[in-house]
């Protein structure tokens, strides 16, 4: 039988009446154009909804927008368009919501042609009131809040000026001209690139990277010949043009740009790109594009300095610059990432790593599932997950994979079972152990969301026809119940729940269409009465993450430690609640050679865990050798994997080698080498 169709499925009793009493409809009395929705703050219940409607006239476009506010998670909305003087809001800038629970909101208005500058509306009380402010410039980008102080804003103007406000947009000051890209760093630092001659495009590869730590009083040039820059975790990266040709390579800094080291990564040509896939304070995943228009590249993982890189995954699918990659951080379990590779026969296959990129494998075939008819071997195939690439290819995939840090182990995704990703209509699969094992959860494509830290999963079928039914599960997707939330079906456009998966409320957005008009409508369902009681100690069970073999002494050890979690029992129908905190207990593991990566100048032969000295340095190894800082060329061959907490056990101590000797081998004469080193 299909998932959840079992007569013996655990059922929530009398749920129809409970949900009917907690279903709230709101019809928006304006025409259907586009709608954008933002939560203001965490656990405040405040939602802002901006509806916009464009009427293209002969010479210009006439636009109308309306602003609505809810303070009860979307059950009721109030039209507050008058608070912004009925001004048309520019949707491409969205609603700039302040960090944390600052309660700050900035809306950027559309202003008529000849004005001196733009206009914003500012609120610092969770959108109860707005202040209109005319700007001395026309904004090119959305206002960017400093992560450390929400009163500090920066924006780029259409004339490439860098503007800063220290009083939440009340007053603005241009701190630099000819700016291409600007980003907040830590401690209210601003990093930005500038051009000298023509424009950002013309000067690409000849840009300068600047830093200001005092909001524009003083500046320091921290890089030249810059192509682009990026921030990830505690790392600052810049791609820098080579002296002699059109290639560029990555340099990295961990001290805000005061000192730089060359990353031991391949250089790339004009048509190639680098991309930071994920970064934290320990390490970074870097994608390096392959030469030519291949649509793939290589993933490298860094050491703790961001300098030495290990090849992690070949043929990683990433379409040309700014394109699509399926790389997904599974936030519900430490160390887990999912992505796609382009195989030799041009089919796309899903790969998963459980140890932060150390090893990649195919996803295990779900129990009780058949391999697709096209599979070479009917018994041996894998689950393949649809993500951004499938969505970009307009396959019948309404949502990317979903995981939440507070819903431990749960991953939900569209997928198909076979040798590769299929263009057939996918089903929805769920893993409750962070991707080790999978089960078919729902037949056909669906929208889905996680509520109450995993206590409830909600889904809506993806259909071109109007819908009026929502499905929900209280046991991590094993059993499903359906609820008809309205008599009159609506054209569904989206599911919305408060970010963080702690809420018990879900909003179903759509529009109704009649002979003459169409209107936006939302239905907000509160599941609080389905989960009648608060969870108690007896509702939780203990679970060891990353467990694959209980007979192995180090079962569950990933990156040097194992973690046990208290997890809600599937049979418990109770509220985790908004204040739920994941209970976990780490225990340190003994070190093995797998807890170490090979340092610069060393490599692991296939099927060997020991790091062996490279007989000769070639390619980017040699370049690193030439341009690398001296202290990075002294090594014992091993470095602990970033974030690895192992203790005792194997300690690969060996004599410290000075690799500078290799650098002055027969590749380059010492004079040449000295003149090039920095």
């Amino acid at each position: 039988s299909a998932p959840g169709e079992d007569e013996e499925c655990g059922r929530v009793r009398d749920f129809v009446a409970k949900l009917a009493n907690n279903t709230h409809q709101h019809v928006f009395d304006d025409l259907r154009g586009s709608v954008s929705l933002s939560w203001v703050g965490d656990s405040t219940g405040v939602i802002l909804v901006l509806t916009t409607f464009h009427v293209p006239l002969v010479i210009m476009t006439f636009g109308q927008s309306k602003l609505y506010r809810s303070e009860d998670y979307g059950k009721n909305f109030k039209d507050i368009t008058d608070l912004i003087n009925n001004t048309f809001i520019r949707t491409e800038f969205g609603m700039a919501i302040g960090p944390e629970n600052s309660g700050k909101v900035v809306l950027t208005a559309e202003v008529s042609g000849g004005s001196r500058g733009g206009r914003i509306f500012r609120s610092s009380d969770f959108a109860k009131n707005f202040v209109q402010t005319d700007l001395p410039f026309h904004p090119l980008t959305q206002m960017m809040y400093s992560p450390q102080n929400s009163d500090y804003l920066l924006a780029l103007s259409t004339e490439n000026g860098l503007w800063v406000s220290k009083n939440f947009g009340g007053k603005w000051e241009e701190i630099h001209k000819a700016v291409c890209l600007a980003k907040w760093g830590s401690d209210n630092t601003i990093f930005f690139t500038t051009y000298a001659n023509g424009s950002c495009k013309a000067d690409l590869g000849a840009l300068e990277l600047w830093r200001t730590s005092d909001l524009g009083k003083s500046f320091k040039t921290i890089g030249v010949k810059i192509y682009s820059f990026g921030l990830g975790g505690r790392f600052l990266f810049a791609s820098v043009m080579a002296d002699k040709d059109t290639t560029r390579r990555i340099h990295v800094s961990t001290d805000q740009g005061d000192t730089w080291s060359m990353a031991q990564l391949p250089s790339v040509g004009q048509e190639q790109f680098y991309s930071i896939l994920a970064a934290n304070d320990d390490m970074v995943f870097m994608h390096v594009d392959e030469p030519g228009d291949t649509g793939f590249g290589t993933i490298f993982t860094s050491d703790d300095r961001g300098i030495v890189y290990s090849k992690s995954l070949d043929r990683h699918l990433y379409t040309t610059t700014g394109g699509e990659t399926d790389f997904t951080n599974v936030t519900s379990l430490r160390g887990v990432y999912i992505t796609s590779v382009l195989s030799e026969d041009n089919s796309i296959q899903t790969m998963i790593t459980f140890d932060q990129g150390g090893r990649w494998t195919h996803l295990r075939k779900p129990e009780n599932s058949e391999c697709a008819a096209t599979a070479k071997n009917k018994n041996e195939c894998s689950l393949h997950i649809h993500a951004s690439y499938s969505i970009s290819q307009k396959l019948n995939v309404p949502m990317a994979p979903l995981s939440e840090p507070n819903a431990v182990g749960i991953v939900i995704a569209h997928g198909s079972v076979g040798d590769a990703i299929s263009v057939m209509v996918p089903d929805v699969y769920i893993s409750d152990d962070g991707g080790y094992s999978w089960t078919k959860m729902l037949e056909g494509p669906h929208y889905y969301t996680i509520l109450d830290s995993g206590g409830i999963i909600v889904a809506i079928e993806h259909s071109s026809r109007p819908i009026n039914v929502i499905k929900f599960s209280t046991d991590e997707g094993q059993c499903w119940q359906t609820y008809t939330f309205t008599r009159d079906p609506i054209y569904f456009t989206g599911l919305a729940s408060e970010p963080g998966a702690r809420s018990m409320n879900i909003s179903i957005w759509g529009f109704t269409e009649s002979f003459l008009t169409s209107q936006w409508v939302s239905y907000t369902i509160d599941f609080k009465d389905i989960l009648e009681r608060n969870c108690e100690e007896k509702d939780y069970t203990i679970w060891l993450a990353h467990s694959t073999d209980p007979e192995d002494y180090e079962d569950g050890c990933i990156l040097g430690y194992k973690e046990q979690f208290l997890r809600l029992r599937k049979s418990s129908v109770c509220q985790n609640g908004r204040d739920y905190v994941v209970t976990k207990q780490p225990s340190i593991c003994l070190c093995s050679l797998e807890d170490f990566l090979c340092d610069f100048g060393y490599y692991r032969p296939e099927n060997d865990s020991k790091c062996v000295e490279q007989p000769e340095l070639k390619g980017h190894d040699l370049e690193f050798c030439l341009y690398g800082r001296e202290e990075h060329l002294t090594t014992n061959g091993y470095r602990k994997i970033p974030g690895d907490k192992c203790q005792g056990g194997v300690n690969p101590v060996r004599e410290v080698k000075d690799l500078k000797k290799k650098c002055t081998s027969n590749f380059l004469s010492p004079e040449k080498q000295n003149s090039k080193s920095n």
Partner: antibody, heavy 124, light 106 residues
């Protein structure tokens, strides 16, 4: 092959405490939960509680909460069950059992290895 | 706590008979059910875990089925060694056992 060897029979007075040990050999003690189950004469099986040696996470059946303490010593691969405020109805055979495990869940797969049982008699 | 009701409490059968014991949970426990066999003076022995998975070394005449709240242990052809007491045990809440079914010679 994993074995669980329990301490010998005990005779106790009402109101006193008893501590039964369960030593594991031949397996990875730390990676499995150990449960304690008792069986009064002519009666069925009754779960008292369990412990996971890594981290020492113990949980108890409601009936015994506050009266039973389960501990584990990883270094000697030994689990202990102490029952206090003994009464005559606590006369039973006390078993320790290893919870089989196929995934990360400790208690879901049945008890695959049992100790030989320890008879505790409570009598004045 | 989840209650487990086992039936019958006693069952008389002959060698070669097909024997069925049922166990009902007071709420859904998915497939988290185990079956044990116990002989007088001995510790229980695990037969079935996760409702239908046969423990290694257990004869294939033993089988388990069910999910949610209704479960069954079946002995396809009763052997002399099978006369014993059988217990079901749920593992999705704090562990609880059924009251037991004594299989005796008819």
């Amino acid at each position: 092959q994993v074995q669980l060897v329990q301490s010998g029979a005990e005779v106790k007075k009402p109101g006193s405490s008893v501590k039964v040990s369960c030593k594991a050999s031949g397996g990875t003690f730390r990676n499995y939960a150990i449960s304690w189950v008792r069986q009064a004469p002519g009666q069925g099986l009754e779960w008292m509680g369990g412990i996971i040696p890594i981290g020492g996470w113990a949980n108890y059946a409601q009936k015994f909460q506050g009266r039973v303490t389960i501990t584990a010593d990883e270094s000697t691969s030994t689990a202990y069950m102490e029952l206090s405020s003994l009464r005559s109805e606590d006369t039973a055979v006390y078993y320790c059992a290893r919870q089989g495990r196929k995934t990360g869940y400790y208690y879901y797969y049945g008890m695959d290895v049992w100790g030989q049982g320890t008879t505790v008699t409570v009598s004045s | 706590d989840i209650q487990m009701t086992q039936s019958p409490s006693t069952l008389s059968a002959s060698v070669g008979d097909r024997v069925t014991i049922t166990c009902r949970a007071s709420q859904s426990i998915s497939s988290w059910l185990a079956w044990y066999q116990q002989k007088p003076g001995k510790a229980p022995k695990l037969l079935i875990y996760k409702a239908s998975s046969l423990e290694s070394g257990v004869p294939s005449r033993f089988s388990g089925s069910g999910s949610g709240t209704e479960f069954t242990l079946t002995i396809s052809s009763l052997q002399p060694d099978d006369f014993a007491t059988y217990y079901c045990q749920q593992a999705d809440g704090h562990i609880t056992f059924g009251g037991g079914t004594k299989v005796e010679i008819k």
